[in-house]
Structures are given as structure tokens and as C-alpha cells.
Interface confidence: medium
């Protein structure tokens, strides 16, 4: 995850009384919630591995970096971080590994400076389409988010709703066009089988896109054309068999792009010829000399860059009467 780590050395710890105790008084400016460590100098609050079941109500107004990792939050309701006065300076929020399975509409409302959000390693069975946009308007107020880290948020098979997990995540990314300013999106390790075709076109500011360690088989219907500022595209450890001409041309047309393609089961048959030719000429693929064939069996572990057209044949398709099992 790319969430910030504090360099604070002067943390003060609060007394370990119940985390759910809510003071009727407005919190003192230098108050530190129970079970948390606070450093006003570093503008950082850490409530880490404390089995909290809800977000502390008495967070200090100075907080810029908030770590709520390793807890048992289960649900983030609407306005989970709404405070009076608001947490106007909160810029980085890390909720990774906190057993969240539901994030409701408007969970991150009233955080005007929130630039970095990490929800990784939570089994998000129910991510509201309006989790990030806050409202169901067709065009919402722009979110200040610049980095959204959603690695390994796929719930176990038996906890999934009867709907596409990919579709649920994409609906949240696209709702109200609120994330037009998003520059980094990490979606690694989510068992994605496909990427809905409209998602990238609506995130025009993306610089970094991480789709590594998914189960993507093809990019045929995915368009990268609008992502003119994309710097890195991580597609390692997927199920990609070949990249076709349209995709190759789009990637080559992106002026800053670096693509990472390691550990995909490339199928080295006649359909691979265009990709091999492209790989030999392009500079956009990082570590291209490490790409090897997985199929067919006779080609296994052959280096793609060392192949020529004679190596890339397709076995003739036999008429049904001649096929044997």
C-alpha cells in the first residue's frame, strides 16, 4: 500500500479505557482518543491493531494522517468521519485490514482535504455506489481524492452478493463523476475477471493504475486512449494470453506509459505474432526480456523476444469427423 507512514517520534498514548466512550463535551484540541497514539507535531493519529468496532468520535481536529488499520470496524456508515468542527486537514486515511465488509453512501463526506484513502485488505461485500461521491446525483461535487488504494478488497466467495464484484467496484468509482481528479488507483489482488469497458475513460487524470494479481484474461474491450497522462500500468500476475493490435497501438500512443506484464500465461501461437513484433520495437514494456510463453506445451518457457514468425503457428483445426478424444 502507498499510504503514508508517520515519521513522528513524539507520540502520546491515551489511557486504555473503552473506545466507544463518547464525551458530551466538544473534544479538546489536544485530546487523543482512547486506544490511539497521537502526535500533534506530525499531525498523525494511529489507532492500530486495537480491535476498534467504530471510528473514534473524539479525533483531534489537527489530524492530517489517520491510521485505523487492523481493527474490526465491520461497517462504515454515512458521515463516519463527520465532526463539528470538521476534520478539515485530514489528508491521508488508512483503513486497511479492519474487517470492513460494508461501506455506505457518504462514508467519507465532510473530509474536504482527503487526498489518499486506503481500504485494502477488507472483505468489501457491500461497497455503496455512492461511497466516494457521497450523493446519488448524476454529477456530484468533485472528490478531493487523488490516491485510492483498493488492493485485496474482494470478499470470500460465500460472502459475495449475487452481483458482479467488478461491477460493484466500478459503480463506486464512476458515480457522479466525482473521481475525475484521481491520479492513482490500485485494484490489485481482487480476482477481477474483466475490466468494465467504461471505467478508464471516466478517470482521465490517472497517472498510475495497478491491476496486478487479478484474473484478467483479455484487454480487448478496454480502451486506454483517454489516459494520456498514464505513467504506469501494472498488469503482472494476471491470466492474459495475448495483447491484440488495438491494445498495442493504444499503449504505444500514450506518451509517458510504462507497462508491467510479468507472470502472465502468454499463448505463443499464430495470434501472438503482432505482440512479439511490437515487443521487439517498443520501449514501454518494463522487463520485456523476462516475458515467456506458457502455452502450447512445446513453447513453454520460451522468451517472447526470441521468437520469430516461424515459431508462432496455429495447429490446423480438424473437421469434426477427424477429431479424436
Amino acid at each position: 500500500s502507498s499510504s503514508p507512514t508517520s515519521s513522528a517520534s513524539s507520540f502520546s498514548s491515551s489511557a486504555p479505557f473503552l473506545a466507544s466512550a463518547v464525551s458530551a463535551q466538544p473534544p479538546l484540541p489536544d485530546q487523543c482518543p482512547a486506544l490511539c497514539e497521537c502526535s500533534e507535531a506530525a499531525r498523525t493519529v494511529k489507532c492500530v491493531n486495537r480491535n476498534l468496532t467504530e471510528v473514534p468520535t473524539d479525533l483531534p481536529a489537527y489530524v492530517r494522517n489517520l491510521f485505523l488499520t487492523g481493527n474490526q470496524l465491520a461497517v462504515l456508515p454515512a458521515g463516519a468521519f463527520a465532526r463539528r468542527p470538521p476534520l478539515a486537514e485530514l489528508a491521508a486515511l488508512n483503513l486497511s485490514g479492519s474487517r470492513l465488509d460494508e461501506v455506505r453512501a457518504g462514508a467519507f463526506e465532510h473530509l474536504p482535504s482527503l487526498r489518499q484513502l486506503d481500504l485494502s485488505h477488507n472483505p468489501l461485500a457491500d461497497l455503496s455506489p455512492f461511497a466516494f461521491s457521497g450523493s446519488n446525483a448524476s454529477v456530484s461535487a468533485p472528490s478531493p481524492l487523488v490516491e485510492l488504494i483498493l488492493n485485496h478488497i474482494v470478499p470470500p466467495e460465500d460472502e459475495r452478493q449475487n452481483r458482479s464484484f467488478e461491477g460493484m467496484v466500478v459503480a463506486a468509482l464512476l458515480a457522479g463523476r466525482a473521481l475525475q481528479g484521481l491520479r492513482r488507483l490500485e485494484l490489485a489482488s481482487n480476482h477481477f475477471l474483466y475490466l468494465p469497458r467504461d471505467v478508464l475513460a471516466q478517470l482521465p487524470s490517472l497517472r498510475h493504475l495497478d491491476l496486478s494479481n487479478n484474473s484478467l484474461v483479455s484487454l480487448t474491450y478496454v480502451s486506454f486512449r483517454n489516459l494520456t497522462h498514464l505513467e504506469s500500468l501494472h498488469l503482472e500476475d494476471n491470466a492474459l494470453k495475448v495483447l491484440h493490435n488495438g491494445t498495442l497501438a493504444e499503449l504505444q500512443g500514450l506518451p509517458h506509459i510504462r507497462v508491467f506484464l510479468d507472470n502472465n500465461p502468454w499463448v505463443c501461437d499464430c495470434h501472438m505474432a503482432d505482440m512479439v513484433t511490437w515487443l521487439k520495437e517498443t520501449e514501454v514494456v518494463q522487463g520485456k526480456d523476462r516475458l515467456t510463453c506458457a502455452y502450447p506445451e512445446k513453447m513453454r518457457n520460451r522468451v517472447l523476444l526470441e521468437l520469430n514468425s516461424a515459431d508462432l503457428d496455429c495447429d490446423p483445426i480438424l473437421p469434426p469427423s477427424l477429431q479424436t478424444s
Epitope: H229, R258, Q286
Partner: antibody
Framework: QVQLVQSGAEVKKPGASVKVSCKAS????????IIWVRQATGQGLEWMGW????????GYAQKFQGRVSMTRNTSINTAYMELSTLRSEDTALYYC?????????WGQGTLVTVSS | DIQMTQSPSSLSASVGDRVTITCRAS??????LAWFQQKPGKTPKRLIY???NLQSGVPSRFSGSGSGTEFTLTIRSLQPEDFATYYC?????????FGQGTKVEIK
């Protein structure tokens, strides 16, 4: 919070080499390019090159080609810039910065003085 | 290499003035341009990216415009803390190139 902390000032003789380090913290080091920019006293900013910490790939401005080397040690989240065959006109403040397009976070700068 | 020409190289202005700095690219760079502010003895600070997007935390009196080869940084009402040197940077092509800088001084 994101921080880039550079090594201390250096005084070198003409013809020598200098190696400046840049230690990153507060983010995942391998996900952003590190660039190097220099600034002679009272002068403007001069882009020297980039290094991708994940792959180790680099690109240098023509002016420094053959004389500069940008490397990294990912185990300690540190980038390095080595400039060889120093001459007096290399006296400058050398900055590392995060980001391959427009840099967003900068190191505090390392003053390199080349003097006989 | 793409040349970035900034004008003027320096200017004198008073608090409250509207200030405009121009950056011209030797070839089209779409909107791949950023503006930085640098005060003496300090590191550069990014103000604007993608020609017109305001960096979070930067006062709204700063704005950027332009596309292709002509770009402008405008400070709507100059404040005492705005006296500094301003640089443009193109990131459309390698090598990246900065403008030579515009020094904004107190009149």
C-alpha cells in the same frame, strides 16, 4: 507524510565524482519515479533525468549522458545520483523529487561545490 | 528538446496587483505543463499541474490556463507571500524542460 531526505553537502575537486543519496519515506518507494534536478546559485532549475525504482530503468538529459548514473536500493528506499568528471560549472544545489511527470515532493537539496 | 520560454524574466508589482506570467513551448505539448513557485533558500513548490489544475492547498488566487504552445499563470491579487520566482515545466516529452524563471519583486 511523504519525505525525501538527501545526503549532506559535498566539496569535490575537478575531475572527481560525487554520489548524492535521497531516502524516501511515507509512501511506497517503487511506485513513483525519482527525478533529479539541479540549480546553480542564482540560476534556474535544470532537469537531469529520471529513475524508475521498480525496474531500475533510467533516462538522462543529453547534456549529462555518459557522466551521470542514477541507481537505487529498494531495500532501504533510497535513490542515488552519481555525477563523474566534475567541473567547476557543476557547482550547484542538487534536488531529488518524486514523480515522473510533474514532481510533487522534493528533497531539501544537496549542495555540491567543485573547487580546486 | 522542447524549449520553454518564460516572459517576463522579472517584474515588479504591488500587493493587490493582478500578475500574469507566460510560458511558450517550442512545439505543442497539449496540457502537459506545471507551474512551480520557489522562494529564496526553499525547494520548489508545485502550484498548478496539467496546465490548469490547482494543487491542493494552493490559494485560489493562483490559476493556470492554456494548451498547445501558449500557457499563462495568473495571480489574481498579489499577496506579500507571493513574491518569489516562478517556473514552468513541460512534461510532454523527455527530456523534461523548465522555463528560465520569472522573478516577481516588490515594487
Amino acid at each position: 507524510q511523504v519525505q525525501l531526505v538527501q545526503s549532506g553537502a559535498e566539496v569535490k575537486k575537478p575531475g572527481a565524482s560525487v554520489k548524492v543519496s535521497c531516502k524516501a519515506s511515507g509512501y511506497t518507494f517503487t511506485t513513483y519515479d525519482i527525478i533529479w534536478v539541479r540549480q546553480a546559485t542564482g540560476q534556474g532549475l535544470e532537469w537531469m533525468g529520471w529513475m524508475n525504482p521498480k525496474s531500475g530503468n533510467t533516462g538522462y538529459a543529453q547534456k549529462f549522458q555518459g557522466r551521470v548514473s542514477m541507481t537505487r536500493n529498494t531495500s532501504i528506499n533510497t535513490a542515488y545520483m552519481e555525477l563523474s568528471t566534475l567541473r567547476s560549472e557543476d557547482t550547484a544545489l542538487y534536488y531529488c523529487a518524486r514523480g515522473g511527470l510533474e514532481p510533487d515532493y522534493w528533497g531539501q537539496g544537496t549542495l555540491v561545490t567543485v573547487s580546486s | 528538446d522542447i524549449q520553454m520560454t518564460q516572459s517576463p524574466s522579472s517584474l515588479s508589482a504591488s500587493v493587490g496587483d493582478r500578475v500574469t506570467i507566460t510560458c511558450r513551448a517550442s512545439q505543442g505539448i497539449r496540457n502537459d505543463l506545471a507551474w512551480f513557485q520557489q522562494k529564496p533558500g526553499k525547494t520548489p513548490k508545485r502550484l498548478i499541474y496539467d496546465a490548469s489544475n490547482l494543487q491542493s492547498g494552493v490559494p485560489s488566487r493562483f490559476s493556470g490556463s492554456g494548451s498547445g504552445t501558449e500557457f499563462t499563470l495568473t495571480i489574481r491579487s498579489l499577496q506579500p507571500e507571493d513574491f518569489a520566482t516562478y517556473y514552468c515545466l513541460q512534461y510532454n516529452r523527455y527530456p523534461r524542460t523548465f522555463g528560465q524563471g520569472t522573478k516577481v519583486e516588490i515594487k
